[in-house]
Interface confidence: low
């Protein structure tokens, strides 16, 4: 008698290892004999697919070499035309030994940055990932963590994090090890011992000492007033990633000496700087034998520049000090007619304050020289090009009179405003700061020979100049 199909052995979940055989059995009772078809994830398995073997009139489905992608729901459907078709389904769970699909690679990282060593794995059950550093299991802490992906993340990398690492993927079926990789920690150049400033007598020998460290070991170069050191002997030694450099100098003039430690990280360089000043005893103290007197400025040329009602020093070595000093300024100002609009107001302020120095009244009236920082600001920032031209002309004797030489101060011989709060005069009209300067393109390729500090802003400024000079 005709009999509708009945599945007597329903499909069950089958566990199989990759590359092994997996078989589903779908036993059917019926008359006439049924036609049995198989699906995986609702997609028909073709009879001629060579990855499968279908036997026993379709009741046995064998996957000949299980792959990771064979995971899914397998169903058999039996139909013989009597009654309805019947179906039974079961799952194939592909079990897989751990496999590292993205192993870690060698890493060079700068101290303080974040390092990530990848370790992406496959496996079923999902492998747990741990890491080995050297020969010991790596312990996680607030800086070091194994991510969900298996990758190792190290925050704020330290020198001691350098070493050999490998990741380990483990599940119930086995363990996989990555190859050993190297984490190299590079450290920015850092100065451990900076050169010390010295106040010495003319003709002394001085040794400046600079010690630096870094990974790789930095090189040390010495700069004198912005240029490579031209004289003096340098001795260097390297020990335990520390470089020690000694510069021996014969002192004939004051100078700013900078030790620069540099090391390379890939295509980039890191540098550390430390500076020392060599000053010559008595070099910049004001002379005590100034002959002159204090009086209010009554001229015309410097009216807009000198502070109102300021006392100025009138030098009695001239027969008529007021007239002689006014003439000096007048001569110098004529030369300024051709300079740039950036330079001119700064130069005018400098010249007026240099020729009509601020006067400190007292038993001995004392002219107060301009602070070195303001002089350097004019020379190196506002009027860099013009100053070079002027110095050239002076050397070649192109100026009409010797008077002009008196109108340009020699900045290096002026006192610093930080040596003593009253030892030098500020230029109230010269108001600038480094932040302004950074926003302008370079005006000249020449860099300042010293790092000019910020000048204090003046509340009485009648103009503010932002020179086109790059401080970077």
């Amino acid at each position: 008698l005709p009999k509708a199909p009945v599945i007597t052995t329903p499909l069950e979940t089958v566990d199989a290892l990759v590359e092994e055989v997996a078989t589903f059995m779908c036993a059917v009772e019926s008359y006439p004999q049924p036609e049995i078809s198989w699906t995986r994830n609702k997609i028909l398995i073709k009879l001629f697919d060579t990855r499968y073997s279908i036997r026993e009139n379709g009741q046995l489905l064998t996957i000949l070499s299980v792959e990771d992608s064979d995971d899914g729901i397998y169903c058999c459907t039996a139909n013989n035309g009597v009654g309805g078709a019947v179906e039974s389904c079961g799952a194939l769970q592909v079990k897989m030994k751990p496999k590292i699909t993205r192993p870690p690679i060698n890493v060079k990282i700068i101290e303080g940055l974040k390092a990530v060593l990848p370790c992406t794995t496959m496996g079923n059950p999902k492998p747990s990932v741990s890491w080995i550093k050297g020969d010991s299991p790596l312990r996680e802490n607030s800086r070091i963590a194994v991510l969900e992906s298996g990758s190792l993340r190290i925050h704020n990398v330290q020198k001691e994090d350098a070493g050999q690492y490998r990741c380990v993927a483990k599940n119930s079926l086995g363990t996989a090890y990555s190859k050993v990789v190297k984490l190299e920690v590079e450290v920015f150049a850092r100065i451990l011992r900076a050169p010390e400033s010295h106040n010495v007598t003319f003709g002394s020998f001085v040794t400046l000492h600079c010690t630096a460290t870094g990974i790789p070991v930095p090189t040390i170069t010495w700069i004198e007033n912005g240029n490579a050191v031209s004289s003096g002997s340098i001795q260097e030694s390297v020990k335990d990633r520390v470089i020690d450099s000694r510069l021996q100098l014969f002192i004939t003039k004051p100078g700013l000496y900078t030790c620069i430690a540099t090391n390379k990280h890939g295509e980039k360089f890191s540098t550390a700087k430390a500076a020392a000043t060599i000053s010559i005893a008595e070099w910049s103290k004001p002379q005590k034998d100034n002959k002159g007197y204090c009086a209010q400025y009554r001229g015309e040329v410097c009216n807009a520049v000198l502070a109102k009602d300021a006392l100025v020093f009138l030098n009695t070595s001239y027969a008529d000090p007021e007239e002689a000093q006014e003439l000096l300024v007048h001569t110098a100002w004529n030369e300024l007619k051709v300079v740039s609009p950036v330079c001119r107001p700064a130069a005018e302020a400098l010249l007026c304050n240099h020729i009509f120095q601020e006067c400190s009244p007292g038993v001995v009236p004392t002219p107060i020289p301009i602070c070195r920082e303001y002089c350097l600001a004019v020379k190196e920032l506002f009027c860099a090009k013009e100053w070079l031209v002027m110095e050239e002309k002076t050397h070649r004797g192109l100026y009409r009179s010797e008077m002009h030489l008196l109108s340009v101060p020699e900045c290096s011989k002026l006192p610093s405003m930080h040596w003593d709060p009253t030892a030098c005069a500020r230029l109230p009209h010269l108001d600038y700061n480094k932040e302004n300067l950074k926003t302008f393109p370079p005006m000249t390729s020449s860099k300042p020979s010293v790092d000019i500090p910020n000048l204090p802003s003046s509340s009485s400024s009648s103009f503010s100049v932002s020179p086109t000079y790059s401080m970077t």
Epitope: S197, A274, T277, K285, A423, P456, S457
Partner: antibody, heavy 124, light 107 residues
Framework: EVQLVESGGGLVKPGGSLRLSCAAS????????MNWVRQAPGKGLEWVSS????????YYTDSVKGRFTISRDNAKNSLYLQMNSLSAEDTAVYYC?????????????????WGQGTLVTVSS | DIQMTQSPSTLSASVGDRVTITCRAS??????LAWYQQKPGKAPKLLIY???SLESGVPSRFSGSGSGTEFTLTISSLQPDDFATYYC?????????FGQGTKVEIK
């Protein structure tokens, strides 16, 4: 090692005088400006006076002008404060302090080294 | 004279805390400001000069910032040795003046 040691403090009657000394060692005394700073019992710090390395520049706080005199003897590595017309308001620990310039030579660094202080008590 | 005002006068904190002390000047002193630490019965110790320059030998947990009239001293992670009184001082112009002090005590 830099050392500053004050001496000369003690009990004095109002209107009286006292001379404080500060002995310096461990650095080239003649190259540094020196200062006196005081601290009344349980109160804050108050700058009193400063003198430059060659005694060219001398400064006082307003309340001591005309009464106190700062001086130094570079040959003896010593700093002094002569205090006259003392009053109860001058009661304090008096510290001698050095200053310097940083490595650039541009920037002034105030009071980088201090002595242990000497107590001046003005009371009748 | 330039007046210096510190706040707070007293500050209670625990080891590991980030501590900030403020100092205000009655007029602009650009960056000419120093910070000192003083422990009972001891002389003050210079920590910071020029508003933000760390004095040699001072731990890097101390930092200074500000310019003009507003300045701050920050201790990034308070240590047992840091419980003391802190003073700011302007050296922009004579007379040089100190703040009234901020006492940092254990909470």
């Amino acid at each position: 090692e830099v050392q500053l040691v004050e001496s000369g403090g003690g009990l004095v009657k109002p209107g009286g005088s006292l001379r404080l000394s500060c002995a310096a060692s461990g650095f080239t005394f003649s190259s540094y400006s020196m200062n006196w700073v005081r601290q009344a019992p349980g109160k804050g710090l108050e700058w009193v006076s400063s003198i430059s390395s060659s005694s060219s520049y001398i400064y006082y706080t307003d309340s001591v002008k005309g009464r106190f005199t700062i001086s130094r003897d570079n040959a003896k590595n010593s700093l002094y404060l002569q205090m006259n017309s003392l009053s109860a308001e001058d009661t304090a620990v008096y510290y001698c302090a050095r200053d310097r310039y940083d490595r650039s030579g541009y920037y002034y660094v105030p009071f980088d080294q201090w002595g242990q202080g000497t107590l001046v008590t003005v009371s009748s | 004279d330039i007046q210096m005002t510190q706040s707070p006068s007293t500050l209670s904190a625990s080891v590991g805390d980030r501590v900030t002390i403020t100092c205000r000047a009655s007029q602009s002193i650009t960056s000419w400001l120093a910070w000192y630490q003083q422990k009972p019965g001891k002389a003050p110790k210079l920590l910071i000069y020029k508003a933000s320059s760390l004095e040699s030998g001072v731990p890097s947990r101390f930092s200074g910032s500000g310019s003009g009239t507003e300045f701050t001293l920050t201790i990034s992670s308070l240590q047992p040795d840091d419980f003391a009184t802190y003073y700011c001082q302007q050296y922009n112009s004579f007379s040089w003046t100190f703040g009234q002090g901020t006492k940092v005590e254990i909470k």
